[in-house]
């Protein structure tokens, strides 16, 4: 798996370089996770030709995956930095159970799946430091998450393929929207 941002040999070898700002570190972290998702999607696509499925399919599923909406204040129209940051952190916390589900879904990219999961935890920590209103962030209930995970793992193989595909695609879209919004902050 690729080395997480801030741990590559270039950072060690170039002490004279300006340290990354908080915003730069977050930006780099998100791009690193997006690269990991691309690698995982490649394996998923190769396994069962799932990547040609239509866009409408994303809406037509019973997974409660986090999604950006106008009210979240992350889009250019009606942009609200504080509301948006709360949405990004809350959304990432909600994605954690789905990232846990992905851990046993990859054969050749097992390390990559783990890297995406761990890097997301680090990203949440970065963003929590940036947030002023931590009280507004709701943490998912562990019991609810545990039963959701059990339910997802009990699905048949076709549904597990679909679920994997939907999680990766939704997570990618959520991170891309977050990246655009964070660059405005």
């Amino acid at each position: 798996a690729p080395v997480p941002p801030g741990e590559d040999s270039k950072d060690v070898a170039a002490p004279h370089r300006q340290p990354l700002t908080s915003s730069e570190r977050i930006d780099k972290q998100i791009r690193y996770i997006l690269d990991g998702i691309s690698a995982l999607r490649k394996e998923t696509c190769n396994k069962s030709n799932m990547c040609e499925s239509s866009k409408e399919a994303l809406a037509e599923n019973n997974l409660n995956l986090p999604k950006m909406a106008e009210k979240d204040g992350c889009f250019q129209s009606g942009f609200n930095e504080e509301t948006c940051l709360v949405k990004i952190i809350t959304g990432l916390l909600e994605f954690e159970v789905y990232l846990e589900y992905l851990q046993n879904r990859f054969e050749s990219s097992e390390e990559q799946a783990r890297a995406v999961q761990m890097s997301t935890k680090v990203l949440i920590q970065f963003l929590q430091k940036k947030a002023k209103n931590l009280d507004a962030i709701t943490t998912p209930d562990p019991t609810t998450n545990a039963s959701l995970l059990t339910k997802l793992q009990a699905q048949n193989q076709w549904l597990q393929d679909m679920t994997t595909h939907l999680i990766l695609r939704s997570f990618k879209e959520f991170l891309q929207s977050s990246l655009r919004a964070l660059r405005q902050m």
Epitope: M50, S53, E60, N156, Q157
Partner: antibody, heavy 118, light 107 residues
Framework: EVQLLESGGGLVQPGGSLRLSCAAS????????MGWVRQAPGKGLEWVSG????????YYADSVKGRFTISRDNSKNTLYLQMNSLRAEDTAVYYC???????????WGQGTLVTVSS | DIQMTQSPSSLSASVGDRVTITCRAS??????LNWYQQKPGKAPKLLIY???SLQSGVPSRFSGSGSGTDFTLTISSLQPEDFATYYC?????????FGQGTKLEIK
């Protein structure tokens, strides 16, 4: 009323190709996973291939993998089975079927006979 | 691949009898087990899905049970129209294999 109508069967020589079609009506085709099941004369049912809703995944029995291709055209409400390198043992009645939300095959076509013989 | 083994392969019974057909999977398939009835020259008909759910329009004399690897189809009181071949099918794995069938004949 749900209807599945297969076509495209017939007599073909070993090594030849055929494309079966299954025209669907009476339900929202794109939302449904679909499959092909065959039955050789006097034998039991054999699951051949399946495609999940929207074409997320395509799946094949080992006996046909690499030779058969399942596909769907949601705009035409049609399921296809492209069969290449046909063998005598592929001779059977081919049924197209819809998957129920509980993962049983709840609606079946009337079947189309494929005969592979020289 | 998951193998599905039905027993018996054939059985003779009389109208009014209670009949049980079993199906065993070579590995756990949770409750992804379906039962079908097929009459000569006709397409199969779904009777039971998800191991124990009765398909709409199917008489209540048909019932299914089991989970994991062992499943049963029971016909509580055989009717003349029930003489047919019955198949189990798993839809848990990637390949949705059928059992070899059980032919139910009139005694």
């Amino acid at each position: 009323e749900v209807q599945l109508l297969e076509s495209g069967g017939g007599l073909v020589q070993p090594g030849g190709s055929l494309r079966l079609s299954c025209a669907a009506s009476g339900f929202t085709f794109g939302y449904s996973s679909m499959g092909w099941v065959r039955q050789a004369p006097g034998k039991g049912l054999e699951w051949v291939s399946g495609i999940s809703s929207y074409g997320y995944g395509t799946y094949y029995a080992d006996s046909v993998k690499g030779r058969f291709t399942i596909s769907r055209d949601n705009s035409k409400n049609t399921l296809y089975l492209q069969m290449n390198s046909l063998r005598a043992e592929d001779t059977a009645v081919y049924y197209c079927a819809r998957y129920h939300s509980g993962w049983g095959m709840d609606y079946w076509g009337q079947g189309t006979l494929v005969t592979v013989s020289s | 691949d998951i193998q599905m083994t039905q027993s018996p392969s054939s059985l003779s019974a009389s109208v009014g009898d209670r009949v049980t057909i079993t199906c065993r999977a070579s590995q756990s398939i949770s409750s992804y087990l379906n039962w079908y009835q097929q009459k000569p020259g006709k397409a199969p008909k779904l009777l039971i899905y998800a191991a124990s759910s009765l398909q709409s329009g199917v008489p209540s004399r048909f019932s299914g049970s089991g989970s994991g690897t062992d499943f049963t189809l029971t016909i509580s009181s055989l009717q003349p129209e029930d003489f047919a071949t019955y198949y189990c099918q798993q839809s848990f794995a990637y390949l949705h294999t059928f059992g070899q069938g059980t032919k139910l004949e009139i005694k």
